[in-house]
Structure formats: C-alpha cells, structure tokens
C-alpha cells in the first residue's frame, strides 16, 4: 500500500483517555505511540475517527475492562463499534460481549473487534461501551484504529 | 497491495513454540502454515519479528492460555505486544488482560491484540506474557504476525 | 491499496446466520452492513469464503457465544478458522478457546481470530465451532471476513 500522492496511505491508531463524562462513547487521544497518517483521517472531539475518502477500511478496537458480577448489572459488558454517515442512521458494525468476572474487587478482561467496511466521505466511527467507568486506561490496554485498504 | 519490485508485499505469520527458557518473551517458529513473505521481515532468535523498511504496519498477536485462579498469582494473565527500535526506549504497543478462570485443572482463554504502528528500519516487535508456562501451543492457538500497509 | 483493474481490491465481510443444521460449520449471509468487493471473492453455500486469486490475505472471524459450565460439556468452547484448498487436506489456520462461564442461564463471551495466510486460487476458508447452538447472532456479534494484501 505504499502509494503516490493520488493514493496516500490512510491509517490511524488512537489511545484511550479517561473521561469524567457520563456518556457511553469512549474518549481517545493522540498521545503515546499513536498513529495519524495525514489529514485524510482525523480524531474529532476526542471521540470519533472521521474519514475524508470513500473506500474499504479495516476498522478495529480493543477494550480492556475490569468488572465484578456482584457490583455490576446482570447484563454483560458490551463494546460496540458504530458508524455515523452523513444523512444516515447510526449503525452498529461490530459488537462483543463478556460476562462480568466473579473475581474481587474486579476481574480484567479484554475484547477485540475488527472488520472490513465501506465508508463514505465524512463517515465517522466510534466505540460505545455499557459502562465506561470499568474501562482500563493503563498503557496499551484500550485503543482504536483503522486503515484504508 | 500487489506491488512491484520497488514496493514488495511484506508480511509474516509465525507459530508459537514451547520453550524451556524462563523468559517472559514468547518463542515462535516458521512451521506449519506460516507466512514469511521475503527477507524484508525476519524472525530473529525465534522471539522477534524484525523489519528492514520504515512504514506503517498492522501488527497482531493471539495468545491462548490455560490457568486457574487458585494455582495462579492474584494478578491477571497479561499479554503485551512490545517494540524495540535502535536507540529508543522499548515500548508497550498493546496489552490485554484476562483474569484467571475458576475451572479445574485450568480454564482456557484466548487473547487477541492488533493495531497499526509506524516502524523504523531495524525495529523489532515481540510478545511478552506474565506466565509462559500457561500458554497453549496446540495447532492454531497462539500466533504472531504483521503486514506492511 | 486503491488499485487498477489489473489489481482490484478484494475484501469480504459477512454476517452470521442462525441455522437449523447440526453441522459445526457456521453459516453466513450477505446481509446488514456486509462487504463483498467483487466476484474475486464469493460466499459459497452460506458457509465459506472462496477466493479466485492467489496471494496473501488477512483473514479474520469474530464469534460471540453464550454458554454455561453446568449445561455444557467439560471441554471449552473452541472456534476454528479452517482452510480448504483444491487437492489438499483441510487445515486449521487459527483457533481460540474459552472456558464456559458459570453465569446463569449462560454467560456471553467473544472470541476474535485473525492472521495473514497465503491462499491458492479456489481456496476456501470457513469457521467451525464446538457448539453452534451457543453462538450469538444479534447485530454485530458474529462475523467473518478477509482482505487481500
């Protein structure tokens, strides 16, 4: 994929950021060993990766969380990779679910999501979780990215 | 990414190898259904994938392990994807953590790591785990690879 | 990887389909937000992705399942990514294993598999699981795909 100016590489990898917001959408930052190939992909409002060019993208997210069955709702921890396209409904691209651990005070688990999707110009992808307070933000544990095929 | 001689495909996929070494760095081999596209990526000392060309790479690892909560330390099983670049800090690129199972004698779990990173010429990537004796080496369970975008 | 007619992009992403068949091979469909780049990759019999061109492919699968330790066999839930090449034995490319949850009625878990492999013209890849009745088919939970490097 080493490409000329007509067809530059487009890739991003961003790092999780703890947030005081109560939203279920995870927050990300360009820090540490992040990747942002050029301005054809951008991190907007710390929450979504937005692409300027139409095409096929491999999109991935990894979420590590720490939860306990007794202290959590009965529903599992779910991470969702979602898509927002101009003039379209938001949609779920990928989801993963892990039942809470019985370990005390909490048990760590990691989820990995990844798939190939067609994105339109201006499309944004973001990651939703059932309980953002359970997400682990230690070095390397939670990240989000994409690459254009 | 079908490329000319100027820009050949660069990809590798190597297979886990049980090791008597006490090191936390996993060992790999070019065996079974492995991939080694050319000499622009090499497996060095059975422990690290080293690249000759600078660029963006999607790097991944999968580790399956079998552990038991009572027989293991309280800390979770952690797999780390790490980077060594000449004259730079070694660094953690990605990590995943899974709390040990209560299943007897041990409970199997699988971890998947993957992300896009810029590598310099001569950079090496390797995989660290908290307890290599718990890693499963059956066909297909534990592997490590990369592809150049 | 934006390519000319000589070297078109080849990618697929298909969505799990519940099946009344007793086979351990998962069933897939071109539905929802699926990807099928062109006829150089096809979904055959709803169960395997078949490629027309030789080359290196990144192949992945994600399986979410819900199981309970008491109601399941003692063996873990295993997902396998397998390869069928013309005139060759079938082979396991990747496997992941997760011990069943103690949660009632069942505990959800997600498995992700992915790796780079050389495929021959006419090669097919498919996904096997130990118990297809435990697989979750809700939006985004279980999917399968590939992309040609």
């Amino acid at each position: 994929m080493q490409k000329g100016d007509q067809n530059p590489q487009i890739a991003a990898h961003v790092i999780s950021e703890a947030s005081s917001k109560t939203t279920s959408v995870l927050q990300w930052a360009e820090k540490g060993y992040y990747t942002m190939s050029n301005n054809l992909v951008t991190l907007e409002n710390g929450k979504q990766l937005t692409v300027k060019r139409q095409g096929l993208y491999y999109i991935y997210a990894q979420v590590t969380f720490c939860s306990n069955r007794e202290a959590s709702s009965q529903a599992p921890f779910i991470a969702s990779l979602c898509l927002k396209s101009p003039g379209r409904f938001e949609r779920i691209l990928l989801r993963a679910a892990n039942t809470h651990s019985s370990a005390k005070p909490c048990g760590q688990q990691s989820i990995h999501l990844g798939g190939v999707f067609e994105l339109q110009p201006g499309a944004s992808v973001f990651v939703n979780v059932t309980d953002p307070s359970q997400v682990s933000h230690g070095t390397g544990f939670t990240s989000f990215g994409l690459l254009k095929l | 990414m079908q490329k000319g001689d100027q820009n050949p495909q660069i990809a590798a996929h190597v297979i886990s190898e049980a090791s008597s070494k006490t090191t936390s760095v996993l060992q790999w081999a070019e065996k079974g259904y492995y991939t080694m596209s050319n000499n622009l990526v090499t497996l060095e000392n059975g422990k690290q994938l080293t690249v000759k060309r600078q660029g963006l790479y999607y790097i991944y690892a999968q580790v399956t392990f079998c552990s038991n909560r009572e027989a293991s330390s309280q800390a979770p099983f952690i797999a780390s994807l790490c980077l060594k670049s000449p004259g730079r800090f070694e660094r953690i690129l990605l990590r995943a953590a899974n709390t040990h199972s209560s299943a007897k004698p041990c409970g199997q779990q699988s971890i998947h790591l993957g992300g896009v990173f810029e590598l310099q010429p001569g950079a090496s990537v390797f995989v660290n785990v908290t307890d290599p004796s718990q890693v499963s080496h059956g066909t297909g369970f534990t592997s490590f690879g990369l592809l150049k975008l | 990887m934006q390519k000319g007619d000589q070297n078109p992009q080849i990618a697929a992403h298909v969505i799990s389909e519940a099946s009344s068949k007793t086979t351990s091979v998962l069933q897939w469909a071109e539905k929802g937000y699926y990807t099928m780049s062109n006829n150089l990759v096809t979904l055959e019999n709803g169960k395997q992705l078949t490629v027309k061109r030789q080359g290196l492919y990144y192949i992945y699968a994600q399986v979410t399942f819900c199981s309970n330790r008491e109601a399941s066999s003692q063996a873990p839930f295993i997902a396998s990514l397998c390869l069928k090449s013309p005139g060759r034995f079938e082979r396991i490319l990747l496997r992941a294993a997760n011990t069943h949850s103690s949660a009632k009625p069942c505990g959800q878990q997600s498995i992700h598999l992915g790796g780079v492999f050389e495929l021959q013209p006419g090669a097919s890849v498919f996904v096997n699981v130990t118990d297809p009745s435990q697989v979750s088919h809700g939006t985004g939970f279980t999917s399968f795909g590939l992309l040609k490097l």
């Epitope: 820090k31 540490g32 190939s37 230690g138 070095t139 | - | -």
Partner: nanobody, 124 residues
Framework: EVQLVESGGGLVQPGGSLRLSCAAS?????????MGWFRQAPGKEREFIAV????????LYADSVKGRFTISADNSKNTAYLQMNSLKPEDTAVYYC????????????????WGQGTLVTVSS
C-alpha cells in the same frame, strides 16, 4: 524542554548495588509520557536499559538487566530511579536518563530530553 540531572553513579565491587536518580525540572511532569535509562560503554553504541510509563507505572527492561535492575518513579519529586543490584563488570558504562514527551506519536521520531550522564564503574 525538560532538564534532567542524574546522580548516584560511582565505583562499586562486582555483586554490589547502586541507586541512580534522575531529577526532572522545566516542563511540567504531566507532559512526560515515559522516562528511562540508557547506557553507553566505551566504544559501544548507546543501549536501552529500562523505561517506566508515567500513565500507570508500567515498566520494561532490557534482557541483560532483567531481574537485577528495577526502575521506579516518585511523581511528587519529579524523579525516576534505577536500583541496580548484582552488578557485573560488564555493567560498567555511562548511564543516561531520558524523557519522552507526551504526544510523541509513532509516525515521527520524537526528540528525547537527555541528562548529561553518570559514570558507573564495576570493578574489584
């Protein structure tokens, strides 16, 4: 820019211990992503020894020092430490402290901030 000052080097017998310190001043500590140590023996290239991530205290070590050296940090004092035990003659080198800025990214080789170095000599 962060100013880094190392101390604690000196002459020690094989099997002995030393504790190196690296005090940071200048740019606020929150702008440091990682801090660590390299060493350079006469006629050899500078080699990585250990690193600590400020975010969560995660550490990595070179194979040559694993189990013998321990890196730690005291955020309140803006200081990183390298505890060196079971020292060997081959550990003789100038030890340099380095700091990596917060938003360094993978697509650019960020400039580290460096200390001036402290000499460690292991000899009987």
């Amino acid at each position: 820019e962060v100013q880094l000052v190392e101390s604690g080097g000196g002459l020690v017998q094989p099997g002995g211990s030393l504790r190196l310190s690296c005090a940071a001043s200048g740019r606020t500590f929150s702008s440091i992503y990682a801090m660590g140590w390299f060493r350079q023996a006469p006629g050899k290239e500078r080699e990585f020894i250990a690193v600590i991530y400020w975010r969560d205290g995660s550490t990595l070590y070179a194979d040559s020092v694993k189990g013998r050296f321990t890196i730690s940090a005291d955020n309140s004092k803006n200081t990183a430490y390298l505890q060196m035990n079971s020292l060997k003659p081959e550990d003789t080198a100038v030890y340099y402290c380095a700091a990596e800025p917060y938003g360094s990214g993978s697509s650019l080789i960020s400039e580290y901030d460096w200390g001036q170095g402290t000499l460690v000599t292991v000899s009987s």
